[in-house]
Interface confidence: medium
């Protein structure tokens, strides 16, 4: 079969938007089924005509009503014939427009007066493609070939550049980039104090405004007193916008408060916020308890435990935890060193222990004492351990 | 003269399978491609899809695709549209349509396509 | 799915200019083509490629196509042009043609 791309040449240039339509001519066959290649891919759209001349010549017709720069590439038919396929000679499809832009100014935040640089690239066809780069409403400098940088010695306020591209099918706009001024850092904001102990406390915080330069650090400055001497200074990498402060005093009222800063330097610290660390657990179990039977039940008794350290703040009261070997348990509260225990089974064997609470929480407990079913008292001692008299 | 003979009207109840036709007469079958499109009572033109003229292969509606099936028979010059299952809704008027091209001095093309009269299709229980 | 409208009428005096319009978003990359329907009949092509008129049909029917809107228009319509006209054209990808929904043109 004879196959040829009709009234095309080997390069067919075409300007953008306008209509093209690429004639195939197939001789020597009585029914080609005629298709059509773009740059290596069947075309699948139905935008396809075919025309008998004879019986042994056809126009095969591929149609594109708008052509854009997608359709440039290489075209060819083909058909098959005695389970082969003939492809014609290809035709090099050039869509030519105004210049399209492969690259375009990028917003920008930049300290006062520093230098910047801003890009700017355009291609046809048709080439070669020119850039003349605005400022606002103001052309800079003259017409320069594609890819342009221009350099810029600084700015003092936010300014809008943009590039424009020439060639002979006419200009193109790129977008406006906008090259904001950065400043410091706003205060941080939000600052709370999330977990507090005796020694540590963690703090989180909202960051300010960051000025458009990227925030490097927080600090976050630690007192006994709002404006009193610095107790601590913590410097943390952000985000997250979070810190543990060490090694506190336990039930102490202090204050923090925070700044974060940019590579341009600080933020203004944020108001002051004050916590207290929690006091500490009290150190001492209570020693010497004992049990006394009376006719009513069993009255406990055990020595007052006095605070070792002023940071566990005042005591009390008591905690009593009683168990027994039926599975019977319970605890109560008493203010005093003295405890009247009932709801008990004398027949059976109990555990007695002690410990004596303040704010934070409760002391160590005291030894056990058992109390034997045998017993008519008790005496503190390992478990299991029976005193009898 | 060109010529597209389709089937008679035909009646069916939903779930029937149905098989319509269109015979094409006065110039090379394989010369054209054929659309198929429905037109239910009172209501506009939908394309269901089409077949190229080598019957190679076949181009549906999104609103037709896996609901019907378009074939030819190149020996005798016919085009068929088949539904396994019909439903009430498939109550329509199908039209079939040559698509394609003419000669006009030998080498330009000129669109122009020739409608069959229809056929009927009503699907009621 | 793809879709191309249509308003559902117009109507003209005898002799005046109708114009029937059609939008689709692939109507800048696609051809429109306009088909007249008259009660009980067949369509029959008005209109292809946007804008070209097969023989036999009257000079007063013309096509154009803009951005995402094509229009048929008919220049001093008569009577006998009272009818439904369809708007077809392919989706963007070229693989399957769809219909507009159908304008009613009524020549009072």
């Known amino acids: 079969a004879g196959l040829k791309l009709m009234g095309a040449p080997v390069k067919l240039t075409v300007s953008q938007g306008q209509p093209v339509k690429l004639n195939c001519s197939v001789e020597g066959m009585e029914e080609p089924d005629i298709q059509w290649v773009k740059d290596g891919a069947v075309v699948q759209n139905l935008d396809q005509l075919y025309i008998p001349v004879s019986e042994q010549h056809w126009i095969g017709f591929l149609s594109l009503k708008s052509v854009e720069r997608s359709d440039a590439g290489r075209y060819w038919c083909q058909v098959e014939d005695g389970g082969e396929t003939e492809i014609s000679q290809p035709v090099w499809l050039t869509v030519e427009g105004v210049p399209f832009f492969t690259v375009e100014p990028k917003d920008l935040a930049v300290p006062p007066n520093a230098p910047f640089q801003l890009s700017c690239e355009a291609v046809g066809p048709p080439e070669p493609v020119t850039i003349v780069w605005w400022r606002g409403t103001t052309k800079i400098g003259g017409p320069a070939p594609s890819p342009s940088v221009l350099n810029v010695t600084g700015v003092t306020q936010s300014t809008m550049f943009s590039c424009e591209a020439h060639n002979l099918k006419g200009l193109a706009s790129s977008r406006t980039a906008t090259v904001h001024l950065q400043a410091l850092p706003a205060a941080p904001f939000n600052i709370t104090v999330t977990k507090l102990s005796s020694s540590n406390a963690s703090v989180a915080w909202m960051p300010g405004a960051d000025g458009r330069a990227l925030l490097q650090s927080c600090t976050v400055q630690v007192t006994q007193a709002p404006g009193g001497w610095e107790v601590l200074a913590v410097v943390v990498p952000v985000p997250p916008f979070t810190c543990l402060l060490r090694d506190l005093v336990p039930a102490t009222n202090y204050s923090l408060r925070v700044r974060c800063a940019n590579a341009l330097g600080p933020s203004p610290y944020a108001d002051w916020v004050p916590f207290q660390t929690k006091g500490l657990a009290p150190a001492s179990a209570p020693q010497n308890l004992h049990a006394i039977r009376t006719d009513s039940g069993l009255i406990l008794e055990w020595e007052e435990v006095i605070p070792e350290a002023p940071l566990e703040g005042p005591l009390g009261p008591y905690k009593l935890s009683w168990v027994q070997d039926n599975g019977t348990q319970d605890e109560l509260t008493v203010e005093g060193t003295r405890a009247n225990l009932t709801g008990w089974d004398p027949q059976k064997d109990l555990i007695v222990r002690v410990c004596v609470s303040n704010a934070v929480g409760c002391g160590p407990w005291s030894q056990p004492l058992v109390v034997s079913s045998h017993d008519r008292a008790g005496q503190q001692g390992p478990p299991h351990s029976r005193t009898s008299w | 003269e060109v010529q597209l003979v389709q089937s008679g009207a035909d009646v069916k109840k939903p779930g029937a399978s149905l098989t319509i036709s269109c015979q094409a007469s006065g110039y090379t079958f394989t010369d054209y491609w054929i659309s198929w499109v429905r037109q239910k009572p009172g209501k506009g033109l939908e394309w269901m899809g089409v077949i190229n003229k080598y019957a190679s292969w076949t181009r549906y509606g999104p609103s037709f695709q896996g609901h019907v099936t378009i074939s030819a028979d190149r020996s005798t010059a016919t085009a068929y549209l088949q539904w396994r299952s019909l439903e009430a809704s498939d109550t329509a008027m199908y039209y079939c349509?040559?698509?394609?091209?003419?000669?006009?001095?030998?080498?330009?093309?000129?669109?122009?396509?020739?409608w069959g009269p229809g056929t009927l299709v009503t699907v009621s229980s | 799915s793809y879709e191309l409208t249509q308003p559902p009428s117009v109507s003209v005096s005898p002799g005046q200019t109708a114009r029937i319009t059609c939008s689709g978003d692939?109507?800048?990359?696609?051809?429109a083509y306009w088909y007249q329907q008259k009660s009980g009949q067949a369509p029959v092509l008005v209109i292809y490629e946007d804008s070209k008129r097969p023989s036999g049909i009257p000079e007063r029917f013309s096509g154009s196509s803009s951005g995402t809107m094509a229009t048929l228009t008919i220049s001093g319509a008569q009577v006998e042009d009272e009818a439904d006209y369809y708007c077809?054209?392919?989706?963007?990808?070229?693989?399957?043609?769809?219909f507009g929904g159908g304008t009613k043109l009524t020549v009072l």
């Open positions: 692939a109507l800048p990359k696609k051809y």
């Open positions: 349509v040559r698509s394609g091209g003419l000669t006009s001095g030998g080498t330009i093309p000129e669109y122009y396509q020739h």
């Open positions: 077809y054209s392919q989706n963007p990808q070229g693989n399957y043609f769809v």
